[in-house]
């Protein structure tokens, strides 16, 4: 019989972090904090407007390290940071905007307008 | 094998403080979160907080702000709640219990605290 | 702050009877982004500190006797015990792990008959 408090090893689990959120938390957080297997994320892409706007949550494990790549997306500029290395640690993050390409001033009227609104602003 | 080894009893007079100790074996200290939880007779199970003791993060249940307070020594793997200002609605047996996602894998075997004159 | 409200309080049952005793959430415990209920199950016997037995609603521990068996969602749930053995005889407490601040029910305790 085991000892009262003694018990065999623990099998390998995902030790749940806890993640800033804002604009992305989900129904389970409590005074934007969320928890996670995976990364804690902090992300900056332009709204419809041009104007950047910053998101930060929790990435599940699974599928994050593609989401965590910030694989260029044509079109949209957007950045995303990640970490696991402590609790909260995206509170550290601070991706910021990729540049302008000047193919983006050269897509058409609309597009035009709307990243030089926006890089005028910075 | 996992072992949380905590005092069998404490005694201490209302208006001190105690620090109850719980020391950790059979694992990776950093790998799981440290949880408290308080037993009083017939009342039930409350949850005091928890610390992640790779970085000494915090979570208190509101209730014990200003109660309890969690800290770690990663290079003994001990875990340790200081409560303070006690009254007898301190008295409980008070467990130390490891969990990965916030239910209890593993605990210990509790200490009885006994708050008296 | 979750609240769990667990039924009976307590329970006689005769070695060999099927037990079955209930928790209820004042909340969902089910996460939309696993389709996971967030409750778990102890035992704890007298004397003793208690015991993981089923974590996620219905995963039993390693080691746990398979005459244990959680079940439910949502906000309603059972542990069920097939044929209840006299080493059974314990307080039986369901624990959210959904968020924080974490919390108990009050117990339900099983006597033996």
């Known amino acids: 019989k085991k000892e009262d408090g003694e018990s065999t090893a623990p099998t390998a689990r995902p030790k749940v972090l806890r993640c800033k959120c804002h604009h992305h938390c989900p129904e389970d957080s409590v005074n934007n904090i969320c928890s996670t297997d995976g990364y804690c994320f902090t992300m900056i892409e332009e709204d419809d407007s041009g104007t950047p706007v910053v998101t930060s949550g929790c990435l599940g494990l699974e599928g994050s390290d593609f989401q965590c790549r910030d694989t260029p997306i044509p079109h949209q500029r957007r950045s995303i940071e990640c970490c696991t290395e402590r609790n909260e640690c995206n509170k550290d993050l601070h991706p910021t905007l990729p540049p302008l390409k000047d193919r983006d001033f050269v897509d058409g009227p609309i597009h035009h307008k709307h990243h030089h609104h926006h890089h005028h602003h910075h | 094998q996992v072992q949380l080894q905590q005092p069998g009893a404490e005694l201490v007079k209302p208006g001190a403080s105690v620090k109850l100790s719980c020391k950790a074996s059979g694992y990776t200290f950093t790998s799981y979160w440290m949880h408290w939880v308080k037993q009083r007779p017939g009342q039930g199970l409350e949850w005091i907080g928890d610390?992640?003791?790779?970085?000494?993060?915090?979570n208190y249940n509101q209730k014990f702000k200003g109660k309890a307070t969690l800290t770690v020594d990663t290079t003994s793997s001990t875990a340790y709640m200081q409560l303070s200002s006690l009254t007898s609605e301190d008295s409980a047996v008070y467990y130390c219990a490891i969990s990965g996602w916030d239910y209890f894998d593993y605990w210990g075997q509790g200490t009885t605290l006994t708050v008296s004159s | 702050d979750i609240v769990m409200t667990q039924s009976p309080s307590s329970l006689a049952m005769s070695v060999g009877q099927k037990v079955t005793m209930s928790c209820k959430s004042s909340?969902?415990?089910?996460?939309?982004?696993?389709?996971?209920?967030?409750l778990a199950w102890y035992q704890q016997k007298p004397g003793q500190s208690p015991k993981l037995l089923v974590y996620?609603?219905?995963t039993r521990e390693s080691g746990v006797p398979d005459r244990f068996i959680g079940s439910g969602s949502g906000t309603d749930f059972t542990l069920t015990i097939s044929s209840v053995q006299a080493e059974d005889l314990a307080d039986y407490f369901c624990?959210?792990?959904?968020?924080?601040?974490?919390?108990f029910g009050a117990g339900t305790k099983l006597e033996l008959k």
């Open positions: 909340q969902s415990l089910l996460k939309s982004s696993n389709q996971k209920n967030y």
């Open positions: 996620f609603a219905s």
């Open positions: 624990q959210q792990h959904y968020n924080i601040p974490l919390t």
């Open positions: 610390i992640d003791p790779s970085d000494r993060y915090t």
